[in-house]
């Protein structure tokens, strides 16, 4: 079932929520206003004295001894205890035991490039999206999702991996960015802040949202994630901003209601299958797209990012649950798990709709639009 649409004519205006009926007074929060920030984020967006752990965009692949075409995923490395809050975007260190898994965290030393040189690349994510400067590409057609409405069985693994909450997706979820650009969904996870501090990774004209969902996909041209890493278009992530609305989102509640079971770092639970598409905005035709990277080590580039124009709305109670329930390493809350925005370095963000033409709720003075580069190829 499709989610209701709101303000679909305004870039990043209006969200969708899982229910049409408002709840009682107790459950109807006022909306929060996301902060405006510079890149990198301002002081308010950095973890505080108790720096909090972050998350990994990419699930690890099974060892090569396993079935070659398997899309089963292992969890990411655990994170270090939090430390200095000043540079949340590029921090990590090697596992002292010397295995392949890197222990990294948001905030503190050493910088992420020491864990993965790609983190110092020129085309990194997340980025600040400026609708006025986006290139309108009519060839960017509505996204196509197939098989995202999962039955209750088999159940799915929901895990607190110390830097995010991650839902592992079964085979069969197909997504197309356009003709010949086909992908399979692997996992989804969230980024969030804390009450009073927004935590989306991408920003819009410096405006950070309360949270962000990422659905990570592997190109059908590759059998394994490690083969796709760093390859242009090898991975694709669908991203949507989460903001506060006046109703409980019933789709998200199916996951949020289970977070207490996985409060402890490294814990996991099984949840019934659900409609994964209901976690995303209803408007698949209006989005921004650019080529970037994973937002955590290994920070591999070549990732196609699709950021929905429409937002998804959760109630304040649900956002509180998301940011207050989980714990990371070192007895620290799992919060503020986002990377600072990275420079575009000449990249042009494309839009599937005329985002720069007097339609943005945060529109600046009119700017000459960039020309469409991709033409939907």
């Amino acid at each position: 079932q499709r989610l209701p649409r709101m303000q679909e004519d305004s870039p990043l205006g209006g969200g969708s929520s899982g229910e049409d009926d408002p709840l009682g007074e107790e459950d109807l929060p006022s909306e929060e206003d996301s902060p405006r920030e510079e890149d990198p984020p301002g002081e308010e967006d950095l973890p505080g004295e108790e720096d909090l752990p972050g998350e990994e965009d990419l699930p690890e692949v099974k060892p090569k001894s396993e079935e070659e075409g398997s899309l089963k995923l292992e969890d990411l490395p655990t994170v270090e205890a939090p430390g200095d809050p000043q540079e949340p975007q590029n921090n990590a260190h090697r596992d002292k035991e010397g295995d392949d898994q890197s222990h990294w965290r948001y905030g503190g030393d050493p910088p992420w490039p020491r864990v993965s040189p790609a983190c110092a690349g020129r085309f990194q994510s997340p980025v600040d999206i400026r609708p006025q400067l986006a290139a309108f590409c009519p060839a960017l057609r509505p996204l196509e999702l197939l098989g995202f409405q999962l039955p209750p069985l088999p159940e799915l693994r929901l895990r607190n991996n110390g830097h995010s909450v991650q839902l592992t997706l079964p085979p069969g979820l197909e997504m197309a960015l356009g003709p010949g650009r086909e992908y399979r969904a692997l996992q989804l996870h969230l980024h969030w802040g804390a009450a009073g501090r927004p935590g989306s990774e991408h920003t819009v004209e410096g405006h950070r949202f309360p949270a962000e969902i990422h659905v990570v996909h592997l190109s059908t041209a590759f059998a394994r994630v490690d083969e796709a890493l760093g390859r242009p278009g090898g991975l694709a992530v669908l991203a949507a901003f989460l903001e506060e609305g006046p109703e409980e989102n019933s789709a998200y509640e199916q996951l949020l209601s289970r977070l207490e079971e996985i409060a402890e770092e490294g814990s996991e639970t099984q949840v019934p299958g659900l409609d994964i598409s209901a976690l995303l905005p209803s408007d698949f035709s209006r989005y921004f797209q650019y080529e970037g990277s994973l937002t955590t080590p290994p920070c591999a580039q070549g990732v196609i990012w699709t950021v929905f124009n429409q937002t998804v709305m959760l109630s304040a109670k649900q956002l509180h649950t998301l940011s207050d329930t989980l714990w990371g390493p070192g007895d620290s809350r799992l919060q503020l798990n986002f990377r600072a925005t990275q420079p575009l370095n000449g990249r042009v963000i494309e839009a599937s709709f005329p985002a720069g033409v007097d339609s943005s709720p945060r529109a600046a003075e009119p700017v000459q639009l960039n020309s469409c580069l991709a033409a939907g190829d």
Partner: antibody, heavy 119, light 112 residues
Framework: ELVQSGAEVKKPGESLKISCKGS????????IGWVRQMPGKGLEWMGI????????RYSPSFQGQVTISADKSISTAYLQWSSLKASDTAMYYC??????????????WGQGTLVTVSS | DIVMTQSPLSLPVTPGEPASISCRSS???????????LSWYLQKPGQSPQLLIY???NRASGVPDRFSGSGSGTDFTLKISRVEAEDVGVYYC?????????FGQGTKVEIK
């Protein structure tokens, strides 16, 4: 409900800490806001605190003038002054505040604490 | 800070008759999600304020349906369809679209 501490009479330069105790709801999951009402005047928003992690936000008019704190273990929020002035004489209300990032509607109010500062 | 301006500041009313209070903000209170970050409170004599309306037009629980809120952007109105004696007091509009909330000066409603 929110129950505030009793009326206070203080001298200029003295310190003061008034309290607001919540019950009947999950205290740590809502912001607590503080509102001042000077005699015969309107409402002024002072600031808010999120009891879960004691994150605070102040009105620019009150930043540095007062300190808002909370102890979630006893479901209590506090408003304190290190050095009172006669102009701090007012009724002070605490209010349960909705919202996640932003402040929001205030749907449950304390009965108010009257603070009188006079030499 | 966003400045909230109410009018009138005093409103004599007749029981059974309608009443209307206006509130204007110096900046738009519409959030990107389409909701107006404005609420209305009534402070009866000698009492704490009580929430009447939030998000511009949503009635709080327990509030009689004779109270309604309308408006969007910078102009908002609180209407009482049929004033009752218990409705006397000071009415405040309150914006929470900025990081620092502000209230209107208040409108004193009294029976003629």
């Amino acid at each position: 409900e929110l129950v505030q501490s009793g009326a206070e009479v203080k001298k200029p330069g003295e310190s003061l800490k008034i309290s607001c105790k919540g019950s009947g709801y999950s205290f740590s999951k809502y912001w607590i806001g503080w509102v001042r009402q000077m005699p015969g005047k309107g409402l002024e928003w002072m600031g808010i605190i999120y009891p879960t992690d004691s994150y605070t936000r102040y009105s620019p008019s009150f930043q540095g003038q007062v300190t808002i704190s909370a102890d979630k273990s006893i479901s209590t929020a506090y408003l304190q002054w290190s050095s009172l002035k006669a102009s701090d004489t007012a009724m002070y209300y605490c209010a349960r505040t909705h919202g996640y990032y932003k402040n929001g509607r205030m749907d449950v109010w304390g009965q108010g604490t009257l603070v009188t500062v006079s030499s | 800070d966003i400045v909230m301006t109410q009018s009138p500041l005093s409103l004599p009313v007749t029981p059974g008759e309608p009443a209307s209070i206006s509130c204007r903000s110096s900046q738009s209170l519409v959030h990107s999600n389409g909701y107006n970050y404005l609420s209305w409170y009534l402070q009866k004599p000698g009492q704490s304020p009580q929430l009447l309306i939030y998000l511009g037009s949503n009635r709080a629980s327990g509030v009689p349906d004779r109270f309604s809120g309308s408006g969007s952007g910078t102009d908002f109105t609180l209407k009482i369809s049929r004033v009752e004696a218990e409705d006397v007091g000071v009415y405040y509009c309150h914006q929470y679209g900025d990081f620092s909330d502000t209230f209107g000066q208040g409108t004193k409603v009294e029976i003629k």
